[in-house]
């Protein structure tokens, strides 16, 4: 329930004045913040009208005003000069007009004694759809049908009935003739411009005699939505642009200088490289809406954004447009990790994934951002279990270290390993980050072997060799499932002679099973961690036979085989191959309430960066 | 001196209707608020709605949330009556209904008895089965 209050209905008439009272709780964040009056459209936006930090619409330019009363905790908006086409539905609030606290309040003005007047006010946004009625009478119902616009002082021919159409309005007018009953016709101007706007007239007949309306148009230009996000973040754009506009191209354009828009993303497939892999294209809904996520959030992202629909899939006169000015805080809540990770062919990498530590409970998701069409994000790992098929022993998603941070791994590496993977959760939205691994010349650090058989009954020891540079690491051996990777007994067997010039402080530490059984098949991993902060991981997968003849096995570097490519699922696994990030659990609206993130206090271990914010494979 | 008399309510059924109406006498000005209040048995009294106008014909409505959808308010023009319709009620609508009156206009907080000089005796609204 929103601690804003005001009058619900308010009713006035033609050219009288209005004050609208909103009562807020007077904290001094309340006190200060800002006060706005916006409009609440059709499709659900709210287009701000007058706010406290000096924004005046121009449809309010000269007869509107808001006063905040800090000390008695009010604002006031008088507003003069009414007319009908104030009625309508707005909100008086505090903050963020989508985000912030509010009141509805809907404002009906009614036409005043002496006020008739012949012109009839349309008020259209840009790139939308104006509708004329234009009444005639009977004797006039098999004359000629126009429209003009007054153009100066002279009256310029727009369509008319017998097929003219002006050049201005080619392929975006029509007149509409309605059935012998009713004495009206229409013209439909599609794709407004912001030119259409002003005085038209329109005529049944061409002699004393004919009926004339007059029309004034009004085109606005969308007021843009002022978003707040974190540096790092992440940002959503829900662009609602009608089902008029269902089948045309979509794009979101970020502007420049003058009235450039450059293109950020379309659904004719261009991606501007600065967004690359870090933007995605939500398919459109039936009444043509779609959403653009925006991840990895820079300063330099920071700007006025709009989004639009033309066959083009740019910006271009007539385009219906939704309009953004997104501000990047710097003073981000979200803590830096690196944004570039490498790894070597045949190594592991682990990722530190940020959420938000308020919501320690929600799922944790990884998933592989892909650029073909307009961007997806198919799931690959999630903190339930599952996993999706391909990664089967090779990927982990672990809830440590936790406390605002967790920890996804991958190993056995290989170059179509390359690209830009999302971390996110069910919870919050703006907390889903991008990093990108990199594949780089060199060698796995850890060695084993690779596939490996163990005999029904019998022992098996399989060895793994850490270099010196792990000297101070906690040593692991796992066995690895959908849920993690379960710590096994390991033990140290001394120094290693896997590595040259290495000395006395490398390692082999073996992982034994006693009397194999059929459960012990499967991946194992080794790998190094500092605490509850994960390095690098090394994976061997261990297939069970029947005995052939008695004894242990003792695995070494020399007689190990390749890891098999393909692995037979288990019957129970849970595979869901188009589990992807347009999963509609993971676009949860934002919740239109007062943003109150606490700033993230750097209990998590922090990654030198350094200015690229990368991070090696091998260095954790 | 204004004089404020309430009218109009009784027993009434779950998901039933009442309208109740206040008269003011006396004193008038151009500008008022007048609003309903309510007092359950044992509990502090409550704003329910109200409706300010100016002299030049401009009204402001104000429900709380409660009662937002279910309960109208409305003035005659002819003279100086407010009425509060009453549809959809609920047991926990049970109450002596008070109205109230303020030359204050539309510069204060009309939630608050505060801001009300003018009060009437009540009008008991029971909705039971």
């Known amino acids: 329930k929103s601690p804003i209050f005001g009058p619900e209905e308010v009713n006035s008439v033609e050219g009288n004045s209005v004050s609208i009272t909103c009562y807020y709780p007077p904290t001094s964040v309340n006190r200060h913040t800002r006060k706005y009056w916006c409009r609440q459209g059709a499709r659900g936006g709210c287009i701000t009208l007058i706010s406290s930090e000096g924004y005046v619409s121009s449809k309010y330019a000269g007869r509107a005003n808001l006063t905040n009363f800090p000390e008695n905790g009010t604002f006031v908006v008088n507003i003069a000069q009414l007319s009908q086409d104030d009625s309508g539905r707005y909100k008086c609030g505090l903050g963020i007009n989508s985000r912030g606290l509010s009141f509805d309040v809907s404002l009906e003005v009614s036409q005043g004694p002496g006020l008739l007047n012949d012109t009839k006010v349309y008020t259209v946004d840009l790139g939308r759809t104006v509708t004329i009625n234009c009444p005639f009478k009977t004797e006039n119902a098999q004359k000629r049908k126009s429209l003009y616009k007054q153009i100066g002082l002279y009256p310029v021919l727009v369509i008319d009935s017998s097929g003219y159409v002006n050049p201005n309005y080619t392929g975006r007018i029509r007149l509409d003739i309605q059935g012998t009953g009713q004495l009206l016709f229409s013209v439909v101007i599609n794709q407004l411009r912001l030119s259409d706007a002003g005085q038209y007239l329109c005529q049944a007949g061409d002699d004393s005699n004919s009926n004339k309306k007059n029309a004034d148009l009004q085109v606005l230009k969308p007021e843009p939505e002022l978003v707040y996000e974190d540096l790092r973040g992440s940002v959503t754009f829900h662009c609602a642009l009608g089902p008029e506009v269902a089948n045309v191209a979509k794009f979101l354009c970020r502007q420049s200088s003058g009235e450039n828009c450059d293109v950020v993303v379309n659904t004719l497939g261009k991606r501007a490289p600065a967004f690359e892999g870090r933007i995605l294209l939500n398919p459109q809904d039936k009444d043509g809406s779609f959403s653009v996520v925006i991840t990895g959030l820079r300063k330099e992202d920071a700007g006025r954004y709009l989004c639009g629909a033309h066959s083009d899939g740019q910006l271009q006169e007539g385009s219906p447009i939704q309009a953004w000015q997104l501000f990047v805080n710097e003073e981000s809540t979200i803590p830096r990790s690196p944004t570039v990770v490498k790894g070597v062919a045949g190594g592991s990498v682990a990722v530190l994934c940020p959420y938000n530590r308020k919501e320690s409970k929600s799922i944790k998701y990884w998933c592989l951002w892909e650029g073909a069409q307009n961007g997806r994000c198919p799931l690959l790992v999630d903190s339930e279990g599952w996993v999706k098929a391909q990664y089967e022993g090779r990927l982990s998603l672990l809830e440590e270290p936790g406390n605002g941070t967790f920890t996804v791994i991958l190993n056995q590496l290989t170059s179509r390993d390359a690209g830009f993977y999302w971390c996110l959760t069910n919870g919050d939205t703006l907390w889903r980050t991008t990093v990108e691994i990199k594949i780089i010349e060199g060698e796995p650090n850890l060695k084993v072997p690779g596939n490996v058989t163990a005999v029904l009954g019998e022992t098996l020891k399989v060895p793994c060799h850490f270099p010196c540079k792990f000297s101070s690491y906690e040593k692991y051996w796992c066995k690895w499932n959908n849920t993690g990777c379960q710590a096994l007994p390991s033990q140290d067997e001394g120094p290693s002679k896997a590595f040259v010039n290495c000395d006395e402080n490398s390692r082999l530490v073996s992982l034994t099973l006693n009397l194999v059984t059929r459960a012990d098949e499967g991946w194992y991993w080794c790998g190094v961690k500092q605490g509850h902060f994960y390095g690098e991981t090394a994976a061997v997968y261990v297939a069970v036979e029947e005995r052939k003849a008695a004894g242990s096995r003792d695995v070494s570097l020399a007689k190990a085989d390749a890891a098999p490519d393909e692995k037979v699922l288990d019957s129970g696994f849970r595979e869901i191959e188009n589990k992807a990030i347009q999963d509609p659990r993971l676009f949860a609206e934002e919740k239109a309430v007062a943003d109150t993130r606490d700033q993230a206090d750097g209990s998590r271990a922090s990654v030198d960066s350094g200015s690229s914010e990368e991070q090696g494979g091998s260095s954790r | 001196e204004v004089q404020l008399v309430e009218s109009g309510g009784g027993l009434v059924q779950p998901g039933g209707s009442l309208r109740l109406s206040c008269a003011a006498s006396?004193?008038?000005?151009?500008?008022?608020?007048m609003g309903w209040f309510r007092q359950a048995p044992g509990e502090e009294r409550e704003f329910v709605s109200a409706?300010?106008?100016?002299?030049?014909?401009?009204?402001?409505?104000y429900y709380t949330d409660t009662v937002k959808g279910r309960f109208t308010i409305s003035r005659d023009n002819a003279e100086t009556t407010v009425h509060l319709q009453m549809n959809s009620l609920k047991p926990e609508d049970t109450a002596v209904y008070y109205c109230?009156?303020?030359?204050?206009?539309?510069?204060?907080?009309?939630?608050?008895?505060?801001?009300?000089?003018?009060w009437g005796q009540g009008t008991l609204v029971t909705v039971s089965s």
């Open positions: 409706i300010s106008w100016s002299s030049d014909g401009t009204y402001y409505k």
């Open positions: 109230a009156a303020s030359s204050s206009g539309t510069y204060g907080d009309p939630r608050s008895e505060r801001e009300y000089r003018y």
């Open positions: 006396g004193r008038t000005f151009s500008s008022y608020t």
